[in-house]
């Protein structure tokens, strides 16, 4: 009589997560009598996956009815495969005994699980930065297998090249994670910009997953300030305007100072948005010229997004105002439209207009 052989015809089987895996095994002889067991791995730490003789294996079904007469097909089907099921499975024949004795093993079938990557999550910097600064965005995706994966970055549809990507772990694993960090240089026009992290994997059938982040969460566009005086009104009041333009985000507090004393404080809210996503705001201050003997120094003080205040001063020349309606106004603008912001890298940027 021929010696029993245990045949596992496939060296490897690849299955998508959530599907069933069929692991084939046949014996070449009915002799000796004894059950088949399936193990994952070898040696003392091997894991029992299915035993024909005893045990409860809710996810495992024999392909062929074990009670079928003269059965020599010991293939099994494992349902609802997850990445944790990856490994090499061995079909092992036992000889009937007390206890049954291991007789012969098949060569093993390596089960690899194709698992989709999770939706990429893109996170931006913890603090906002201004134009010309470089900020980092991180993209993470987890739980995929096999390890091969492609990640690309885009800004407004244009592919980025300044990024670094790692896939972990480096060695064999049931599933893998990817983490990529891209460096993006901000411009004043980036309020409406978007960065996209695109992940391509064999499980996605050519339809990559995308994660996005809005640069609006990462950027701060400081305001321009301009203070101007309108015509003298009939009631000896001068209308002084502070125009705050091209700023983002909207969080802004404006304070009027008359000769260094706080006159009024306002908070920006519900402003219309410019095409580029920035905001403009205009504040007026009425100065009663007849109430002043000397020139009035008006200061428009703007605190934007928690940054140090920016001042723009303007002197109203009281002596230049005749006390009748409709006369020309004379004013001297002594302010310097200066914004002084301290950024993460401790550089100072001065803008003069």
């Amino acid at each position: 009589e021929e010696e029993l052989q245990v045949i596992q015809p496939e060296k490897s089987v690849s299955v998508a997560a959530g599907e069933s895996a069929t692991l084939n095994c046949t014996a070449t002889s009915l002799i000796p009598v004894g059950p088949i067991q399936w193990f994952r791995g070898v040696g003392p730490g091997r894991e029992l996956i299915y035993s024909q003789k005893e045990g409860h294996f809710p996810r495992v079904t024999p392909v062929s009815d074990p009670t079928k007469r003269n059965n020599m097909d010991f293939s099994i089907r494992i349902s609802n495969i997850t990445p944790a099921d990856a490994g090499t499975y061995y079909c092992v024949k036992f000889r009937k005994g007390s206890p049954d004795v291991e007789l012969k093993s098949g060569a093993g079938t390596e089960l690899s699980v194709r698992a989709k990557p999770s939706a990429p999550v893109v996170s931006g910097p913890a603090v906002r930065a201004t134009a010309e600064h470089t900020v980092s965005f991180t993209c993470e995706s987890h739980g995929f297998s096999p390890r091969d994966i492609t990640l690309k970055w885009f800004k407004n549809g244009n592919e980025l090249s300044d990024f670094q990507t790692n896939v972990d772990p480096a060695g064999k694993s049931v599933s893998y994670s990817i983490r990529s960090t891209a460096r993006v240089v901000l411009t004043r026009r980036d309020v409406h910009s978007q960065v996209i992290c695109e992940v391509a994997h064999v499980t996605l059938q050519g339809d990559p997953l995308r994660g996005t982040a809005n640069l609006s969460e990462a950027i701060r566009v400081p305001p321009f300030l301009e203070v101007t005086q309108q015509s003298m009104r009939a009631d000896n009041q001068v209308n002084v305007t502070c125009q705050v333009t091209k700023f983002y985000p909207q969080r802004l507090q404006l304070t009027w100072l008359e000769n260094g004393n706080v006159s009024r404080t306002e908070m920006a809210s519900a402003l219309p948005e410019n095409k580029d996503g920035t905001y403009n705001w205009t504040s007026w201050l009425l100065v009663n010229v007849s109430a002043h003997r000397d020139d009035v120094k008006l200061t428009c003080q703007v605190e934007h997004d928690g940054q140090p205040a920016v001042n723009k001063s303007f002197s109203v020349k009281v002596s230049a105002h005749p006390k009748e309606q409709g006369s020309n106004t004379a004013a001297e603008n002594t302010g310097t439209n200066e914004r002084d912001y301290k950024d993460d890298d401790d550089k100072h940027h001065h803008h003069h207009h």
């Epitope: 009589e1 004894g34 035993s51 003789k53 005893e54 074990p66 009670t67 007469r69 003269n70 009937k96």
Partner: antibody
Framework: QVQLVQSGAEVKKPGASVKVSCKAS????????INWVRQAPGQGLEWIAM????????HYNQIFKDRATLTTDTSTSTAYMELRSLRSDDTAVYYC????????????WGRGTLVTVSS | DIVLTQSPDSLAVSLGERATINCRAS??????????IFWYQQKPGQPPKLLIY???NLDSGVPDRFSGSGSGTDFTLTISSLQAEDVAVYYC????????FGQGTKLEIK
């Protein structure tokens, strides 16, 4: 370790029925056939029938087809053999036996249940 | 049905001697290269015990003084050197179709 534990001895009147049980342990009950065999006093072995507990497929010896019924309760891993219309020549030891190799053989046996049919 | 006929009905053999029991089937019990004959030993007051399966394969724990041979319709159980504990009734059984047993052979010590 495979064990088949049978119910105790029974004394029955002619025309009555008897139901013998066989509780299995030490293996997956639904993966192996259970055979029933009887042996009259001083006589040889006589195969009655067999059942597949996984789907209750049965095969009967023609001699017993009309009088014997095999059933199983998979929740308790117990096989049953009911014999109806008992006659005095049904007096015998009734064995259950498990087929470990799906060869229609009898690898492991219960200790037997003596059924005595007497008026 | 396949009928199995054992011979002899009884047999007395001296300790240490060879004992041979025959089993003849009314038609072939061979299929796909296997001979579907099984041998059992039954001692008084005990259930039968499987000795040989598929004509020539020793079951687990059975001493190797027992052996089985034959094919087709004629089969033999041999005990090469009889021991006192071998006194029993021996049955052949086939499973080529639904099972049947031979009538049994009683083995005693001479």
């Amino acid at each position: 370790q495979v064990q088949l534990v049978q119910s105790g001895a029974e004394v029955k009147k002619p025309g009555a029925s008897v139901k013998v049980s066989c509780k299995a342990s030490g293996y997956t009950f639904t993966n192996y056939w259970i055979n029933w065999v009887r042996q009259a006093p001083g006589q040889g072995l006589e195969w009655i029938a067999m059942i597949d507990p996984s789907d209750s497929e049965t095969h009967y010896n023609q001699i017993f087809k009309d009088r014997a019924t095999l059933t199983t309760d998979t929740s308790t891993s117990t096989a049953y053999m009911e014999l109806r219309s008992l006659r005095s020549d049904d007096t015998a030891v009734y064995y259950c036996a498990m087929d470990y190799g799906s060869l229609y053989a009898m690898d492991y046996w219960g200790r037997g249940t003596l059924v005595t049919v007497s008026s | 049905d396949i009928v199995l006929t054992q011979s002899p009905d009884s047999l007395a053999v001296s300790l240490g001697e060879r004992a041979t029991i025959n089993c003849r089937a009314s038609k072939s019990v061979s299929s796909s290269g296997y001979n579907y004959i099984f041998w059992y030993q039954q001692k008084p007051g005990q259930p039968p015990k499987l000795l040989i399966y598929l004509a020539s394969n020793l079951d687990s724990g059975v001493p190797d003084r027992f052996s089985g041979s034959g094919s087709g319709t004629d089969f033999t159980l041999t005990i090469s050197s009889l021991q006192a504990e071998d006194v029993a009734v021996y049955y052949c059984q086939h499973s080529r179709e639904l099972p049947t047993f031979g009538q049994g052979t009683k083995l005693e010590i001479k």
